[in-house]
């Protein structure tokens, strides 16, 4: 039994990071494996993640952290019984993915105007909170070739559009995801989509 | 919100010991490990030692090894530390603190007084 | 005795900015993060850097925290009478054990 693809992990800076890797073949990764991790820190205890499969050769394991600070760097193990298949590190600040932004909600009730709003998903006490920016996505239901990106660079989690600034009459679907410059990080996944029926009053031609 | 709270000031006689606790609220308590330091009257701060509430783990500065001790209830979410042979020099404001390479929150501190 | 020194004092005027160091080695700073802690007469220490240059919420950005090699920097602009305080480094030491060394502190007057 070999490691094919390494270990790679992402963090979400907040309570786990996910650990992808590929074994040279059909592994049940759940009985066969084992990853071991520890803090390198005075008095860290070793935690063990087992894995989950991720395909025929693919392993996924889901590592809880506590109090995650840049500081923080981890030892991997990979462990097949009682044999060392792979020996690493890991910074989670190095490696973040964001997660991603909840409860898109679109306010049509405003003047011709959409209002969007979603919530941050850290707490505020994580360093995260103050420092994603988002992109949002729009798109029409019915036109493949309607489809807009949004970027919202403030910190504010909320997007004001003109409604006429879309079709009339027809629906539309919007997402948000996050990422934040200080660390360099990826894009979180999409949020969950939300869908809305775009209709505004066009202005009285003389 | 975070919260440590100390217990009260205590008046010790030189030799004696001293058991200060530091209850904590607003936080998972076995995820962040504390620190205890401690401010001698018009004096700086000074790092005194170390307890992973998870396990109870602990370190101790080099200064006060042999006679502090830290202890943690996880039922309770209370950490204490136990300072013996004490003497005048260890008049002093106690404090708990949150955090892993910093800390974060800070208790109000228990002064402790050493007089014969 | 501390490992890490700091300015015993420092002062300047209202809506100046004042800086203060502090000097480690490579066990501590030089290997490690920075932290700053404000202490106001009478009270508890409070977390105001950490990181070396992170403020946590609720901190002012008129606080700024740097670091170089194996010395770091707290600057604060436009002081306030309310900054009048004492102020401690941080950071962690491996060189035996690990330990928590604290800077020897600064006064800060708010002329």
């Known amino acids: 039994m070999k490691v094919l693809q390494e270990p790679t992990c992402v963090s979400d800076y907040m309570s786990i990071s996910t650990c992808e890797w590929k074994m040279n073949g059909p592994t049940n990764c759940s009985t066969e494996l084992r990853l071991l991790y520890q803090l390198v820190f005075l008095l860290s205890e070793a935690h063990t993640c087992i894995p989950e499969n991720n395909g025929g050769a693919g392993c996924v394991c889901h590592l809880l952290m506590d109090d995650v600070v840049s500081a923080d760097n981890y030892t991997l193990d990979l462990w097949a019984g009682q044999q060392l298949l792979w020996k690493g590190s890991f910074k989670p600040s190095e490696h973040v993915k964001p997660r991603a932004p909840g409860n898109l909600t679109v306010h049509t009730n405003v003047s011709d105007t959409l209002l969007l709003t979603w919530s941050n998903p850290y707490p505020p006490d994580n360093y995260l909170y103050n420092h994603l920016t988002y992109a949002v996505n729009i798109w029409s239901e019915n036109d493949p070739a309607d489809f807009r990106i949004y970027n919202v660079t403030y910190l504010e989690p909320s997007l004001r559009i003109a409604a006429s600034t879309l079709k009339s009459g027809i629906s539309y679907r919007a997402r948000v995801r996050a990422w934040a410059q200080c660390y360099n990080t990826t894009w979180s996944e999409w949020s969950p989509s939300t869908k809305w029926h775009n209709s505004y009053r066009e202005p009285f031609e003389q | 919100q975070v919260q440590l709270v100390q217990s009260g000031a205590e008046v010790k006689k030189p030799g004696a010991s001293v058991k200060v606790s530091c209850k904590a609220s607003?936080?998972?308590?076995?995820?962040?490990?504390m620190h205890w330091a401690r401010q001698a009257p018009g004096q700086g701060l000074e790092w005194m030692g170390i307890i992973n509430p998870s396990g109870g783990s602990t370190s101790y500065a080099q200064k006060f090894q042999g006679r502090v001790t830290m202890t943690r209830d996880t039922s309770t979410s209370t950490v204490y530390m136990e300072l013996s042979s004490l003497r005048s020099e260890d008049t002093a404001v106690y404090y708990c603190?949150?955090?892993?390479?910093?800390?974060?929150?800070w208790g109000k501190g228990t002064l402790v007084t050493v007089s014969s | 005795q501390s490992v890490l020194t700091q300015p015993p004092s420092v002062s300047a005027a209202p809506g100046q900015k004042v800086t203060i160091s502090c000097s480690g080695g490579s066990s501590n700073i030089g290997n490690s993060y920075v932290s700053w802690y404000q202490q106001l007469p009478g009270t508890a220490p409070k977390l105001l850097i950490y990181?070396?240059?992170k403020r946590p919420s609720g901190i002012p950005d008129r606080f700024s925290g740097s670091k170089s090699g194996t010395s770091a920097t707290l600057a604060i602009t436009g002081l306030q009478t309310g900054d009048e305080a004492d102020y401690y480094c941080g950071t962690w030491d491996t060189s035996t054990v690990w330990e928590w060394p604290f800077g020897t502190g600064t006064k800060l007057t708010v002329l």
């Open positions: 607003g936080y998972a308590f076995t995820s962040y490990y």
């Open positions: 990181d070396n240059n």
């Open positions: 603190a949150r955090g892993k390479y910093w800390m974060y929150d």
